[in-house]
């Protein structure tokens, strides 16, 4: 006999957008207060009742007069085919499910959405469906006419489908990919017909779990939570992901306005523990992450402020700063970095409650420093605050070093003209701005005879005219605080410089390597002197101080040029501060071939000889050491006499070449000539790196034998 609690009043509604069938029914004959565990078997057929595509047993507890609901999502859009639904019921006896007594089936309920489609010749479903990347999707077309051949395309590529009935074909898309934010285009068209019908399949990239979720407070009033939302789902702003923060201890929840951060008001009742759940959610899915923390362990202090320097002296300064009050009087650890010339020169750690103080010592006078401070929770380190930076300058001190002084002495009309040179003190030596230099000239024969001269900075030279006696010169640098130690130098009328022999040195890319013999007796040091621009009238005098135990040095300068001769003088400085010349060196950083030939004067022309001379040719001003000269002689006969050799010039002309090996020999007699003959000559200097240019030859014709001299 049929079960008394059969399903009745079965109603089926549809939700096309979600491709869902909603079933609603009731069970009669149940007393109002009665509860019964029941199972309902639901069958769904497609196209015809015999084509069952879904069977499901739905178990629930039924109360009297209760409306029951069940939903089913169809893979195939509901518009694509008729669906039929029926159900039956049984009492749910879990102990013997195989012995269930089923009620009769309800009558089939038919759902046919196609009836409401309208009168167009072609439809494509589903419309504007939103799916996740990687999903499988079924689409279909419904045609109002059976005659036409219909083709469907996915992004322009024809799809293979399967016919459900003469008017309907369906297409299964597997593992759909994200193509563009405006969706994937699918369209169908009648092959020889009218129009195209398209749908858009909106494909979302899979919503990612938020990464690096973290919260912190800067002021104990607001918790700032941040996270990395991961890759964008690729959907335009109509259906983006939303983010929600839920805190379980307080039970509060907030919808975040931004994709990657959210603020949470700290409870005034001093809640210490927080248990947050961050939920990312879009139309298709939810993703959650959790963090549990103690508020005092997540303090990211605000940057210190009011950074000041007091009691700034020559070598010390007291740095003070304030930190923002947090209400909870816990200790901050502050880190101080002191910068000098852009580099960290000191690091300090200081514990601070409200005000910080630190004495910076070991500083240089008149130096600009920069100090920066940042703070973090001392008990539970979380994050450093931002740095706060402030500059200060130490106080000036008297210059600490004597200026580096040298001189140039010339005798002019019985007087001694002394040009004094000094190098500016370095910043570390000057200890402040140098305002002037004091020069004291002391006559060593008359110690009471003092001359004082003041030269304003930034001058680096002065000229003194003295008589031929010995003088001691003191030079000091002065700033607003005081005077430097003095540089002392003795000058006398006769420097005795000229008796020293000059020695040649070979320069390299690195400069000139100079060495000298050590001097016996008391010597305080050596000075090497040279000119950076020897061809200029002012010559740019340079000097280098060396210790008493040094007998070699390398002199290098950016001013050194190839083809320029540099002259070096090495002086010893006696204990009485008297400089005396020890050695002279001369050389080239790089020798170049001679650039011009001597201006030659011809004389004593006879029928058999003539004399060539080039007395005013200066070998010192040449771009290399001149080793000698070549005299070239061209003649019609082309014969070369002893003492000369045949030479072929660059223009293939042949001549005779005479070689002079002494650079001081600036005269040459060309002999063995024929009377009334035509000759051409050229004189070129030569050096280790080449000879002068083969320019124009000078023409000469010898007279007959009887012509007067």
């Amino acid at each position: 006999e049929p079960l008394p609690w059969a399903p009745e009043s079965l109603k089926v509604s549809i939700n096309s957008t979600h491709q869902c069938l909603h079933l609603q029914w009731s069970v009669h004959n149940l007393a109002y207060h009665q509860e019964l565990k029941m199972v309902f078997q639901i069958e769904i057929s497609r196209i015809k009742t015999s084509n069952v595509i879904w069977v499901e047993n739905y178990s629930t507890t039924v109360k009297g007069n209760q409306l029951l609901h069940w939903s089913w999502e169809s893979q195939l859009p509901l518009e694509c085919a008729k669906h039929f639904i029926r159900m039956r019921s049984a009492v749910d006896d879990a102990t013997t499910p195989e012995q269930r007594f089923w009620s009769n089936w309800s009558s089939w309920e038919e759902v046919d959405v196609q009836n409401s489609l309208g009168h167009e010749p072609l439809f494509v479903f589903p419309k504007d469906k939103l799916v996740e990347e990687g999903s499988n999707v079924t689409i279909c077309y419904v045609s109002r006419s059976q005659q036409n051949n219909i083709s469907c395309y996915l992004e322009g590529v024809r799809m293979q489908g399967q016919q459900l009935d003469p008017n309907v074909s369906m297409f299964n898309l597997h593992n759909v990919a994200f193509i563009r934010e405006t969706g994937t285009n699918i369209y169908c068209k009648v092959d020889r017909g009218d129009d195209i019908k398209g749908i858009v399949l909106f494909v979302s990239k899979i919503l990612e779990e938020p990464k690096d979720f973290s919260c912190e407070t800067r002021d104990f009033q607001t918790l700032s939570c941040t996270w990395d939302p991961g890759r964008d789902t690729g959907l335009l702003k109509q259906l983006p992901q939303s983010y929600t923060l839920f805190e379980s201890f307080s039970g509060k929840k907030t919808l975040c306005k931004h994709k990657g951060w959210c603020n949470w008001q700290v409870a005034p009742e001093s809640q210490e523990m927080y248990n947050f759940t961050l939920t990312a959610e879009n139309y298709l899915r939810k993703r959650s992450v959790h963090i549990l923390f103690n508020l005092t362990h997540r303090v990211h202090p605000m940057a210190p402020f009011n950074v000041l320097f007091k009691d700034v002296s020559v070598t010390n300064a007291t740095m003070t700063w304030k930190v923002h009050s947090t209400g909870n009087y816990y200790t901050l650890l502050c880190q101080v970095e002191l910068y000098g010339e852009g580099k960290v020169i000191q690091k300090h750690n200081v514990s601070v409650k409200v005000n910080g103080e630190l004495v910076l010592s070991g500083l240089e006078p008149d130096t600009e420093y920069s100090a920066q401070v940042r703070c973090a929770n001392a008990n539970h380190f979380w994050k450093w605050s931002e740095w706060t930076r402030q500059n200060f300058t130490t106080v000036e001190a008297a210059p600490s070093e004597a200026p580096d002084v040298w001189r140039n002495v010339k005798s002019v009309q019985g007087y001694c003209v002394v040009t004094l040179f000094w190098k500016p003190l370095s910043r570390l030596q000057a200890n402040g701005e140098i305002l002037f230099y004091n020069i004291v000239v002391e006559d060593l024969d008359r110690p009471s005879g003092l001359q004082l001269l003041s030269v304003p900075a930034p001058a680096n030279r002065t000229e003194l005219t003295l008589d031929q006696r010995a003088y001691q010169i003191h030079v000091t640098a002065n700033n607003s605080v005081g005077t430097s130690p003095a540089s002392v130098l003795v000058v006398s009328g006769d420097p005795g410089d000229e008796e020293v022999e000059e020695e040649r040195v070979k320069g390299t890319e690195d400069g000139f390597s100079l060495s000298w013999k050590p001097q016996p007796g008391n010597i305080t040091g050596y000075i090497v002197e040279w000119c950076d621009r020897p061809r200029d009238p002012l010559c740019d005098l340079q000097w280098k101080h060396l210790g008493p135990n040094t007998t070699s040095t390398v002199i290098s300068s950016d001013a050194f040029r190839p083809g320029v001769r540099y002259n070096f003088r090495i002086y010893g400085i006696s204990t009485e501060m008297v400089p005396y010349l020890l050695e002279k060196k001369t050389g080239y950083s790089q020798e170049l071939a001679p650039s011009d030939n001597p201006r030659v004067v011809m004389s004593n022309l006879t029928s058999h000889s003539f004399t060539l001379s080039w007395k005013d040719y200066s070998t010192e001003s040449q771009p290399s050491f001149i080793r000698g000269y070549h005299v070239y002689l061209k003649s019609k006969a082309g014969q070369c006499h002893p003492g000369s050799e045949k030479a072929v010039l660059s223009d293939d002309s042949v001549c005779c070449k005479y070689k002079i090996d002494d650079p001081k020999q600036k005269m040459f007699v060309v002999g063995n000539l024929q009377p009334e003959s035509f000759y051409e000559f050229l004189v070129t200097p030569y050096s280790a790196v080449g000879e002068g240019p083969h320019g124009a030859f000078t023409k000469v014709t010898t007279p007959d034998e009887y012509s007067p001299m």
Partner: antibody, heavy 118, light 107 residues
Framework: DVKLVESGEGLVKPGGSLKLSCAAS????????MSWVRQTPEKRLEWVAY????????YYADTVKGRFTISRDNARNTLYLQMSSLKSEDTAMYYC???????????WGQGTLVTVSA | DLQMTQTTSSLSASLGDRVTISCRAS??????LNWYQQKPDGTVKLLIY???TLHSGVPSRFSGSGSGTDYSLTISNLEQEDIATYFC?????????FGGGTKLEIK
């Protein structure tokens, strides 16, 4: 036959507002996405806005975002374009289009002229 | 924005001629290229969509081809009624953009 008829043309001052309508007939309006496309006095065509068949998806050109609103009434078979904060560069002939494929304007109305001038 | 360029702004041809109008995209548009015809009275019609598919009611003398960034519209046998301005348009990437148009005239 597909028929799209725009209306609402007018002369507006800069900063003013105007609402355009497009009456659709000859097809099931609710089945199709629709767009507005305009043609400037220099005869350049510019896509303005798009709305999906159900109205869930709406896109705008950057030049009109925040000033123009596209909407549809499927019961009335009508497409709308609410234009506000109008600028002189919005002066154009506005066409309503039916889009069977996203970004393809298969059928066009005859156009309605909007002039923005002081 | 993706730029569409029609290098020829006007073109003269004789009736019966084979005419080709070209269009270049500033980046790959995956064949989402449409061609429109605008008659002198302002009427606009879709001729070809998805590079080469003829829209319903469009004569078969019209054809389209291309890929990547270079596309063209060909009229194989020019007729009087084809006198119009032709626009290309990409539908691959927002914002959807049009070429500047090519005006076709009779010699």
């Amino acid at each position: 036959d597909v028929k799209l008829v725009e209306s609402g043309e007018g002369l507006v001052k800069p900063g003013g507002s105007l609402k355009l309508s497009c009456a659709a007939s000859g097809f099931t309006f609710s089945s199709y996405a629709m767009s507005w496309v305009r043609q400037t006095p220099e005869k350049r065509l510019e896509w303005v806005a798009y709305i999906s068949s159900g109205g869930d998806y709406i896109y705008y050109a950057d030049t009109v975002k925040g000033r123009f609103t596209i909407s549809r009434d499927n019961a009335r078979n009508t497409l709308y374009l609410q234009m506000s904060s109008l600028k002189s560069e919005d002066t154009a002939m506005y066409y309503c289009t039916r889009d069977p494929i996203t970004g393809t304007f298969a059928y066009w109305g005859q156009g309605t002229l909007v002039t923005v001038s002081a | 924005d993706l730029q569409m360029t029609q290098t020829t702004s006007s073109l003269s041809a004789s009736l019966g001629d084979r005419v080709t109008i070209s269009c270049r995209a500033s980046q790959d548009i995956n064949n989402y290229l449409n061609w429109y015809q605008q008659k002198p009275d302002g009427t606009v019609k879709l001729l070809i969509y998805y590079t080469s598919t003829l829209h319903s009611g469009v004569p078969s003398r019209f054809s389209g081809s291309g890929s990547g960034t270079d596309y063209s519209l060909t009229i194989s046998n020019l007729e009087q009624e084809d006198i119009a301005t032709y626009f290309c348009q990409q539908g691959n990437t927002l914002p959807w953009t049009f070429g500047g148009g090519t005006k076709l005239e009779i010699k």
